[in-house]
């Protein structure tokens, strides 16, 4: 059964009372009745107004009291939600230096974790060159106090590579002129006999004319070291070698080079060119021991 | 070996055209400039035409400039020249030869011009 | 064009001599020569080239020497195969040019 039923029910039962008080005796007179009378009527009257007026006062007095109390509160929210919102701020502004601070911090710890890392990758390869060094002096001493007819490790300064040891020049020199400082350092102008001997020399030499030990000197194409042409790597660019004619400098071209991109070219042989120095090492010797 | 084989020489009137062929080998062909050089009876040696590798660069003697035309296929390892309006100084052995300094020459054939 | 003369046009010369024959360009070569030799009804043979470099297989009796514009052939001892023509070449430029040659003949 739902409220409002059982409300309008109990409104029926009231209205079936008041029929059955109408329908009894007569009822004795009411004390209203009685109290309205004359004098007495006029003494209550005053007294209700005299109550009424002290109730007026009284919650007159207790209205401006709670409207006072009311400002003081207003007053004293208006002085908190300022109050907070200062603290708020003041906490966001601080909250906000500690994250820049914390920003800072990271990227100060980040840059010195950096920092140890490439400290430390720098002393590994330090270390690494230290050990080279230190086989390689310790190579040169055993090649000193020995007769100097093998070779078993690289000069200083050379670098080694599949059980040869190359140079690279920084200046530049005529094809001959290379070719006999070469030799003068037991050695001879590069001899490129594969692709990964060519990506090699290619790698260090950069995109630079580089001489190399191979020539035909308007003979037949040889190199310096006797390897074999014919049968042998070649890596000339497209249309090369052409023994060109057009420069003027008389007669073609017969010393071959490194172009920029790696491939080779001829080209007159008195061009100063850098170049690369190649010696093999002693195939049956083995690196000694460091102590 | 390096081998320089000529053919395509023989009796041409003149005004004629001939073409002659070399075929190398035992050297690879297409790093070398070629030359033509041919030698009348009882003379000297002269040089006629000359072609870098690649084609690129060819030159002729003044005696066959706009008559000969030196051509090569790297592929078949071949050198040729062709000779148009043939007179009786053309008369001669040509050989081919390998390189600037003709480190190496063919046997040569003979073009002889005669009415 | 550049001229190449040679001398003397002709030679004779007997078995073991020492001989050197001579080219002249008319005007700088550098080292651009190269010398043949010709025997009688052959193709012509290649000694030398940049003045003094000697072709594989060719026998060191053989030298060359020279730069610029004069350059000689020298010939330690002579051999019965040796008696032929003798030409030089220049290849420093183009038209290439040769010499009107040598005749060593046996004395």
């Known amino acids: 059964m739902t409220k409002e039923y059982q409300d309008l029910q109990h409104l029926d039962n009231e209205e079936s009372d008041h029929h059955q008080l109408r329908k009894g005796p007569p009822p004795p007179q009411p004390l209203l009745q009685r109290l309205c009378s004359g004098p007495r009527l006029l003494l209550l009257s005053l007294g209700l107004s005299l109550l009424l007026l002290v109730v007026v006062c009284v919650i007159g007095s207790q209205n401006s009291q709670l409207q006072e109390e009311l400002r003081g509160l207003r007053e004293t929210f208006s002085n908190f939600t300022a109050s907070t919102e200062a603290q708020v701020k003041g906490l966001s502004t601080q909250g906000g230096n500690v994250g820049r601070k914390m920003k800072s911090l990271e990227s100060q710890l980040e840059k010195q974790q950096k920092d140890l890392s490439e400290d430390h990758s720098s002393l590994l390869l330090h270390v690494k060159q230290f050990v080279s060094d230190l086989r390689s002096l310790s190579c040169q001493m055993a090649a000193l106090q020995g007769n100097g007819s093998e070779r078993t490790c690289c000069p200083v300064n050379w670098v080694e590579h599949e059980r040869s040891c190359y140079w690279f020049s920084r200046s530049g020199k005529a094809w001959a002129d290379a070719d006999n400082y070469c030799r003068l350092e037991d050695a001879h102008l590069v001899v490129v006999t594969s692709w990964e001997e060519q990506k090699f020399v290619q790698h260090h030499i950069g995109p630079v004319n580089t001489w190399m030990g191979l020539h035909d000197q308007n003979g037949p194409w040889k190199w310096v070291d006797g390897t074999d042409y014919e049968t042998g790597f070649k890596n000339w660019r497209p249309e090369q070698p052409d023994d060109w004619y057009g420069h003027g400098l008389g007669g073609g071209e017969d010393c071959a080079h490194f172009t920029d991109d790696g491939r080779w070219n001829d080209d007159v042989c008195q061009r100063p060119y850098r170049w690369v120095c190649e010696t093999e090492l002693d195939k049956a010797s083995q690196e000694p021991p460091l102590l | 070996e390096v081998q320089l084989v000529e053919s395509g020489g023989g009796l041409v009137k003149p005004g004629g055209s001939l073409r002659l062929s070399c075929a190398a080998s035992g050297f690879t062909f297409s790093s070398y400039r070629m030359n033509w050089v041919r030698q009348a009876p009882g003379k000297g040696l002269e040089w006629v035409s000359s072609?870098?590798?690649?084609?690129?660069?060819?030159y002729y003697a003044d005696s066959v400039k706009g008559r000969f035309t030196i051509s090569r296929d790297n592929a078949k390892n071949s050198l040729y020249l062709q000779m148009n309006s043939l007179r009786a100084e053309d008369t001669a052995v040509y050989y081919c030869?390998?390189?600037?300094?003709?480190?190496?020459w063919g046997q040569g054939t003979l073009v002889t011009v005669s009415s | 064009d550049i001229q190449m003369t040679q001398s003397p046009s002709s030679l004779s010369a007997s078995i073991g001599d020492r001989i050197t024959l001579t080219c002249r360009a008319s005007q700088g070569i550098s080292n651009y020569l190269a010398w043949f030799q010709q025997r009688p009804g052959k193709a012509p043979k290649s000694l030398i080239y940049a003045a003094s470099s000697l072709l594989s297989g060719v026998p060191s009796k053989f030298s060359g020497s020279g730069s610029g514009t004069d350059f000689t052939l020298t010939i330690s001892s002579l051999q019965p195969e040796d008696f032929a023509t003798y030409y030089c070449?220049?290849?420093?430029?183009?038209?290439?040019?040769f010499g009107g040659g040598t005749k060593v003949e046996l004395k």
């Open positions: 070449q220049q290849y420093n430029s183009f038209p290439f040019t």
């Open positions: 072609m870098s590798n690649s084609s690129s660069s060819i």
């Open positions: 030869a390998r390189q600037a300094a003709q480190d190496y």
